[in-house]
């Protein structure tokens, strides 16, 4: 069975705040709690959700939360149910409302000596208790012919004279906090010897030198005065007017006029109407001068046929606000068709190549008039004048390709090659016609080309294949100088290209006949054994029957390739004693020996006094220090060949010999002593 | 003993609808939730829903949300699942089970037009 | 929702073997899993809930075991009326979701 050991409980609550309904279930199987409102399932939400199995709430809501919850448990193996007692809140709450005329119906009805009634309507539970203000001072009950009504949150006025004007608002309190009035309501009870406003003066725009009229009447029994002054507050009467506004007049009406406005006359005028009793009525308005600002500039624009565009005129700032207009060919713009005018824009339909032109936007007030044109053009699609051609371009030469065409506004010309964009370099220019050069033709230039012609109407495009026509050439050219190894086999490679496939042959440079040992096979020389008598001027000819021929000259050392006699072994040498590092090569030219140590060569000239290298190659080092110890490489070469090898120098200290240690214990490594 | 007995089985077309009902007997019906499942041939076994016939509260799998509607009859301890719009793949057994321990015999639906 | 995975899907097996079923929960349903025995024409039988308590009536070579996402259904040693269907489900949340079942056969 199921048991709840925590149920939930009717309990107080206040409106907004946090509050927490309990329900804590024990069952023999797993359990399913949640929660029913007046017997429907409560869904979470962020304001009110399960929290474990009982019901949290973020922000009690006396709307949303009145009613009876009931937490319900599910055993999920035998499907029993249970149902906890009921709970409910007590919700406590208050809120702000207007305060209202209840009596009588409209505030046009309010006279004086009349009765009149307002409401609080501020509510709450539980019921809060009101107070009246009346311009922020509290008015306390029964006093000065008035009565407050809690219970209905009524104030009674009885009757109501001048003395009841004023701003009233109320308040209320409760146990839950308190609240005040969110609209007051203004009581105007007239008093006639209170001067009234019946016509108010409004601000005016006038051009210079225009004339500017003001109105302003009061009524009030008996009649009330009424005085102009000006900004400055002299007065302005027709007796005595004030230097800057000697062309005012005031009328019996109480209407003020003045002629020939200059800048110095605007400002702010005011009218001053005084009843027998009561405040003086202070009305304001201001005198504004007319003035426009300059149009900014249009950019001018490009449009394609066929499209709906806009050009928007932005008027220049002026007083009062400038009226925009549209014209084109001295003609103002309609407000609905093809081409007219919405708002302040310009807007073209649908827009034909014969809308092109200048148009202009006109704005004007009481200050004068302004004007900027906008130059539009209607952008044509490219047509050719003449398209690039399949041609044969000669390799090493400038070659040109043709893309010639003509647009509204000047078409723009991209080329491509293998379908990649060319970018200008030292090898590809685009002349402003269109055409393509190429500075210095390359064989791998023959492919297609594609220039591409755009306005922003559209774009035209046209293809051409290259062919270039090859020079003859050796691939690569033989190098003119080259060894061969002595009693070895050997070959000397020549190769060419051209517009036809060149034939190539080697002969001796004195002419004479290649020996038997000596093959020449499809350009390449190649010697069976190398002899002594190889050594000589060679030349490679290349031929064709358009191009004629070529040839390149070589001259063939026969060498014996270096090997080394000796060299340089692992050295440990102690610390200030010598190393010697031997190094000996032969070969033919004789090798000379060069020493790298520690990275860079070892200039015989630079060596100072510690190193020396003698004649046969060996490098010897004088009073070694640590910093010597390195890697040190010799380096065996002729003109035709190089070698090296490489030994470490290590350098270390003498040892302290030890008691036990007898007077003719080796050394720990294998040294040279000297 | 705790006895769950389905209506028999049906044969609907598409778009119908179909009611299924399952009398609970020996237990106090409004004391246990019902639950409703389905098994597609050769398919395994979803569940679509749990009815409190205390007060007819009821959760839904938001997948049959809008198509299936269960209900009780407390006077006669009977539990309703009636699903509506019927398409091909609902043809399937239906079961209604009191808890995880007490099953009915199953109703099988067919759909075909 | 909770996924569940349940393997193998088929399994052959003869009397007196020992067999494990396991189910793995998408995210973790802490111990509630239950097992269930289904046969051709009978109501499904509850085995096991809330991971290893034996339903009552139920033969105690039936035994479950784990939590959070990965669980076991053990049968110590198989008899004849053991070879059926095996389904698990998981009963931390609704929607109450199923594994696809394991069919277990005579070999």
């Known amino acids: 069975a199921i048991v709840f050991i925590k149920q939930p409980s009717s309990q107080d609550a206040l409106q907004g705040r946090r509050a927490l309904l309990r329900c804590e279930v024990e069952a023999p199987g797993p359990v399913h709690v949640y929660w029913l409102l007046d017997g429907a399932p409560v869904q979470d939400t962020e304001r009110r959700f399960a929290q474990g199995s009982s019901l949290s709430f973020a922000a009690v809501d006396r709307l949303q939360d009145s009613g009876t919850f009931q937490c319900v448990a599910r055993d999920d193996v035998t499907g029993e149910e249970a149902r906890s007692a009921n709970a409910s809140f007590n919700i406590k709450w208050i809120e702000a409302g207007p305060v209202v005329l209840k009596h009588p119906a409209s505030e046009a009805e309010i006279q004086p000596q009349t009765q009149v009634t307002l409401r609080c309507h501020i509510d709450g539970h539980p019921r809060p208790t009101y107070q009246w203000f009346r311009d922020g001072t509290p008015l306390s009950d029964g006093q000065s012919n008035h009565t407050v009504s809690s219970k209905e949150r009524n104030l009674t006025l009885r009757p109501a004279g001048p003395e009841h004007s004023g701003l009233y608002s109320c308040c209320a309190h409760s146990a839950f906090g308190q609240a005040c009035s969110s609209q007051n309501f203004t009581l105007s009870i007239a008093d006639e010897s209170f001067a009234r406003v019946v016509l108010a003066p409004q601000d005016v725009v006038v051009a210079r030198y225009e004339e500017a009229m003001f109105h302003c009447q009061f009524s009030a029994q008996p009649p009330p005065s009424l005085q102009w002054l000006f900004e400055d507050e002299t007065p302005i009467t027709n007796r005595s007017r004030p230097p800057h506004l000697r062309r005012a007049t005031v009328f019996a009406n109480g209407s003020l006029l003045l002629t020939q406005v200059r800048p110095r006359n605007a400002g702010i005028y005011r009218c001053i109407g005084q009843g027998q009793r009561g405040p003086p009525i202070i009305l304001e308005a201001t005198l504004h001068l007319a003035e426009i600002e300059d149009m900014p500039l249009f950019e001018p624009r490009v449009f394609t046929a066929g499209s709906e565009e806009r050009v928007t005129c932005l008027p220049p700032k002026g007083l009062p606000e400038p009226s925009v207009w549209w014209e084109h060919a001295g003609v103002r713009l309609p407000t609905h068709g093809r081409v007219y005018q919405k708002g302040h824009e310009l807007v073209l339909a649908n827009i034909a190549e014969s809308d092109a032109g200048v148009y202009t936007c006109h704005a004007a007030n009481l200050a004068g008039q302004r004007r900027q044109d906008v130059n539009i053009t209607v952008a044509t699609v490219p047509s050719w004048l003449k398209k690039p051609q399949d041609s044969q371009l000669e390799e090493g030469k400038p070659g040109y390709l043709d893309c010639l065409t003509q647009a509204t506004p000047k078409p723009t010309v991209v080329w491509y090659r293998n379908q990649m964009l060319i970018s200008e370099d030292s090898r590809f220019e685009v002349f402003k016609n269109g055409t393509l050069r190429i500075n210095s033709v390359e064989v791998y230039d023959g492919t297609w080309y594609r220039c591409m012609s755009s306005t922003p109407a559209g774009s035209i495009e046209a293809q051409a294949r290259v062919q270039v026509l090859e020079k003859l050439k050796f691939t690569p050219p033989p190098q003119p100088q080259q060894c061969m190894e002595f009693d070895k086999e050997a070959t000397v490679p020549c190769s060419a290209t051209g517009r036809e496939k060149p034939t190539i042959k080697w002969e001796r440079a004195d002419g004479s006949s290649l020996p038997e040992w000596v093959t020449d096979n499809a350009g390449t020389l190649h010697f069976a054994r190398v002899t002594r008598d190889d050594a000589g001027n060679y030349t490679c000819i290349a031929s064709n029957g358009p191009q004629g021929q070529i040839r390149a000259h070589v001259q063939l050392t026969v060498a014996v390739f270096i090997t080394f006699k000796v060299e340089p072994e692992r050295t440990t040498v102690y610390q200030g004693h010598t190393a010697l590092l031997q190094c000996e090569a032969q070969g033919d030219p004789k090798p000379l020996i060069q020493w790298k140590g520690k990275d860079r060569i070892l200039d015989p000239t630079k060596l100072g006094p510690r190193m020396h290298i003698f004649q046969n190659g060996s490098l010897v080092i004088h009073d070694v220090a640590p910093e010597d110890s390195g890697r040190y490489t010799c380096i065996a070469g002729n003109s035709c060949n190089i070698k090296h090898t490489e030994a470490p120098l290590y350098v270390v200290d003498k040892p302290v010999p030890e008691e036990s240690e007898g007077p003719g214990s080796p050394p720990p490594y294998k040294m040279i002593q000297t | 003993q705790v006895q769950l007995v389905q209506s028999g089985a049906e044969v609907k077309k598409p778009g119908a609808s179909v009611k299924i009902s399952c009398k609970g007997s020996g237990y106090t019906f409004t004391d246990y939730g019902m639950h409703w499942l389905k098994q597609a041939p050769g398919q395994g076994l979803e569940w679509i829903g749990v009815?409190?016939?205390?007060?007819?509260?009821?959760n839904y799998n938001q997948k049959f949300q809008g198509r299936a509607t269960m209900t009780v009859d407390k006077s006669i301890s009977t539990a309703y699942m009636e699903l509506s719009r019927l398409r091909s793949d609902d043809t399937a057994v239906y079961y209604c089970a009191r808890g995880m321990g007490y099953w009915g015999q199953g109703t099988l639906v067919t759909v075909s037009s | 929702d909770v996924q569940i995975t349940q393997s193998p899907s088929y399994l052959s097996a003869s009397p007196g073997d020992r067999i494990t079923i396991t189910c793995r929960a998408s995210q973790s349903i802490s111990k509630y899993l239950a097992w269930y025995q289904q046969k051709p024409g009978k109501a499904n039988k509850l085995l096991i809930y809330?991971?290893?308590t034996l339903q009552s009536g139920v033969p105690s070579r039936f035994s479950g075991s784990g939590s959070g996402t990965e669980f076991t259904l053990t049968i110590s040693s198989l008899q004849p009326e053991d070879f059926a269907m095996y389904y698990c489900?998981?009963?931390?949340?609704?929607?109450?979701?199923f594994g696809q079942g394991t069919k277990v056969e005579i070999k």
């Open positions: 009815i409190s016939p205390y007060y007819g509260d009821v």
């Open positions: 489900q998981q009963h931390n949340e609704y929607p109450w979701t």
């Open positions: 809330s991971g290893s």
